[in-house]
């Protein structure tokens, strides 16, 4: 168990051109907070999918009046670290999501209001025990300064939490085998035993004795692949006898969710669906009112003054989620035509079109030929979202500009000379050749050899020569 | 030394249930699985069970679902088995053992209990 | 369920022989097998664990070998005190099972 912690040093515009106009006013003021949320592993997930490692808010900053004329300077922060607690092992791979709020504190209706200012998301390894980690982020024309670190909670150490520390038995050394317990040096490692014969690859223990396996693995110590050949469904039935199980319990097992919340299993974890007055993890907050800020991504908060009150996320398009939690992929719904690219940004759908085409949804099919012209007699020719030129004789290229030489290919079978004219080309044939190609060879009797006809038909029937 | 102290044998009505109980000694008793064995004559060894005391983890042979119930007390580093719905077929002598420190299997066992069960 | 197969219940032998009891698996369990013996009105005692690794106090005329299905107990200079019964158990898989036993006897 531990400890992740998150210090925004800076919150502000970034370098360079552009900068942002500042996100209060003296008509409208706000302060800001932070939400991080912490996934294991490096996973690409999306923003959405639960923070399996944890999630924490931060209190509200100092409200900020913007000056005017003046440019939007680093904004005031609240006070404190960010804290998420791990129960388990530190997985030192890690994904994060840093979410900057502004809580508009003009006179709304309903009480205040949260819109999203910025996101940053990035992938990292981190030690824990470790110093504290510097990182930069941009997003769009804002720029956040921010330090981390993850540290165990005693009586575990070590980069992964994992190993206990207790107090020395005797005041000079540790027993054997045992190191002293950096920084803790009058303390003494207590390795962390699993269960004998607990497979290294496939099994683990949080807790002394136990043989926790990986998914994929079940049995005593972790060494049968799960094989769900027999199994009745995708984790099998619940038996010890079955070599079908997900290894130790599923994670809705018991259900995690508090508060009346909902399990459902996800391919890493698991994930609960609150009732409307809890969120977290597992629903375990309670007691939420509007000011405590519990709808996301920009949700507008309504009711909810008291405890004992629900209050309403009414969500912005694109959230969905009695938090606005979930992101709803509207790009699903293939909202772009004519082979246009769907990019949600989360505020607006953005439709990238190709080439000829135009609109908000890519549903305006553009006049390829408008202004172009094509040179030397061409004709322009429409089609699939480009145009080309169809050119006149003795020309060639995408405008018609190239004059084309016509025997480059040479054109003319079997050692014809080939001469370029102004109505194309002419075809000089060597002797015993014939046609506009030098295609045919001259037979003694004066007939040319075309082709027979195929069975079934008689000579002077209408055919079609393959 | 590892100690593995059962309660004494009983003559049990149909019907009935039993408590049988594995008091261990001279080891951490969260750390280690406690494992439950029936043997009854002509049958051989018949594994029914584990609990690991520490986080009261249960795994039950499914041949035993229903039949057998597991508790452990680390205030009293006692462990327990509740046999219930007894019949004819529980007669049997019923050993608890202890999994292994560094080598896995049942290295400890207790003297074991003799459940009989008749009307 | 695993069966472990112990095809000879009974197996005679005389003082200073050298006797091996084999057990089959009915699918690989790897090294995941401990052998047993016991004695009559007495509890099992463990001999042998990951089929070839003495428990701490077991004389080493006792040796266990074999790996995926088919493993063997052996016991060179065989001792009077060595008749018991002797049981294979696989700890592979849940639920962990027991061979049927074999009974070693004076010839």
């Known amino acids: 168990a531990g400890v992740f912690e998150l210090q925004i040093h800076s919150f502000g515009p970034g370098p360079g051109p552009g900068a942002p106009r500042s996100p209060c006013s003296a008509r409208l003021p706000c302060r800001l907070f932070f939400r991080v949320c912490l996934k294991p592993g490096l996973s690409e997930e999306a923003a959405e999918s639960p923070c399996a490692l944890g999630a924490a808010l931060s209190a509200r900053g100092p409200v900020y009046t913007e000056q005017p004329g003046a440019p939007a300077p680093d904004l005031p922060l609240p006070d404190g670290l960010l804290q998420v607690p791990f129960r388990d092992a530190w997985p030192g791979t890690f994904s994060f999501i840093i979410e900057t709020w502004r809580e508009e504190l003009g006179d709304q209706i309903g009480g205040p209001a949260w819109s999203l200012l910025a996101r940053v998301a990035g992938r990292r390894r981190l030690a824990a025990g470790g110093p504290w980690a510097r990182d930069i982020q941009r997003a769009g024309a804002w720029e956040l300064r921010f330090s981390y670190r993850a540290r165990c909670e005693p009586p575990a150490v070590g980069t992964a939490c994992t190993r206990l520390c207790r107090p020395r038995s005797a005041p000079s050394r540790c027993g054997p085998g045992l190191r002293p317990c950096a920084p803790l040096e009058d303390e003494c490692e207590a390795p962390l035993v699993c269960r004998a014969g607990c497979s290294p690859e496939h099994g683990f223990c949080e807790q002394p004795g136990e043989c926790r396996c990986l998914e994929g693995w079940t049995g005593p110590l972790c060494t049968v692949p799960v094989s769900t050949s027999s199994c009745l469904s995708p984790r099998g039935p619940s038996s010890a006898t079955t070599g079908c199980l997900v290894p130790g319990p599923g994670p809705c097992d018991g259900n995690p969710c508090a508060n009346g919340g909902s399990c459902s299993e996800t391919p890493r974890s698991f994930e609960c669906t609150c009732p409307r007055g809890f969120y977290g993890l597992r629903c375990e907050v309670s007691g939420v009112t509007c000011a405590d800020g519990p709808c996301f991504n920009g949700g507008l908060c309504v009711g909810g003054a008291d405890p004992d009150s629900a209050y309403i996320c009414h969500c912005p398009p694109g959230f969905q989620g009695s938090n606005c939690e979930k992101r709803v992929d509207r790009c699903s719904l293939q909202p772009c035509r004519n082979g246009g690219l769907c990019l949600d940004l989360g505020h607006a759908l953005r439709c990238r079109c190709r080439a000829g085409f135009a609109g908000p949804r890519c549903e305006h099919d553009l006049d390829d030929c408008a202004g172009r012209a094509c040179a030397n007699g061409g004709t322009c020719v429409e089609g699939g979202g480009a145009h080309r030129c169809s050119c006149a004789l003795g020309f060639g290229g995408r405008d018609c500009r190239e004059r084309a030489d016509p025997c480059a290919a040479r054109p003319c079978a079997h050692g014809g000379r080939c001469y370029a004219h102004f109505s194309g080309l002419v075809c000089a044939c060597a002797p015993g050749y014939m046609g506009a190609r030098c295609e045919f060879p001259v037979h003694p009797d004066g007939a040319s050899a075309l082709p027979a006809a195929p069975p079934g038909l008689r000579p002077g029937d209408p055919q079609r020569y393959l | 030394q590892v100690q593995l102290q059962q309660s004494g044998g009983d003559l049990m009505k149909p019907g009935a249930s039993v408590k049988i109980s594995c008091k261990a000694a001279g080891y951490t008793f969260s750390n280690y699985y406690i494992e439950w064995v029936k043997q009854r004559p002509g049958h051989g060894l018949e594994w029914i069970g584990e609990?690991?005391?520490?986080?009261?983890?249960?795994t039950y042979n499914e041949k035993f679902k229903g039949k057998a119930s597991f508790t452990a007390d680390t205030s009293s580093n006692t462990a327990y088995m509740q046999l219930s719905s007894l019949t004819s077929e529980d007669s049997a002598v019923y050993y608890c053992?202890?999994?292994?420190?560094?080598?896995?299997?049942?290295?400890?066992w207790g003297q074991g209990t003799l459940v009989t069960v008749s009307a | 369920d695993i069966v472990m197969t112990q095809s000879q219940k009974f197996m005679s032998t005389s003082v200073g022989d050298r006797v091996s009891v084999t057990c089959k698996a009915s699918q690989n369990v790897g090294t995941n097998v401990a052998w047993y013996q016991q004695k009559p009105g007495q509890s099992p005692k463990a001999l042998i664990y990951s089929a070839s690794y003495r428990y701490s106090g077991v004389p080493d005329r006792f040796t266990g070998s074999g790996s995926g299905t088919d493993f063997t107990l052996t016991i060179s200079n065989v001792q009077s005190e060595d008749l018991a019964e002797y049981f294979c158990q696989q700890y592979n898989n849940y639920p962990l099972t027991f061979g049927a036993g074999t009974k070693l006897e004076l010839k």
């Open positions: 609990i690991l005391p520490g986080s009261g983890s249960t």
């Open positions: 053992a202890r999994w292994g420190a560094r080598e896995p299997g049942f290295p400890y």
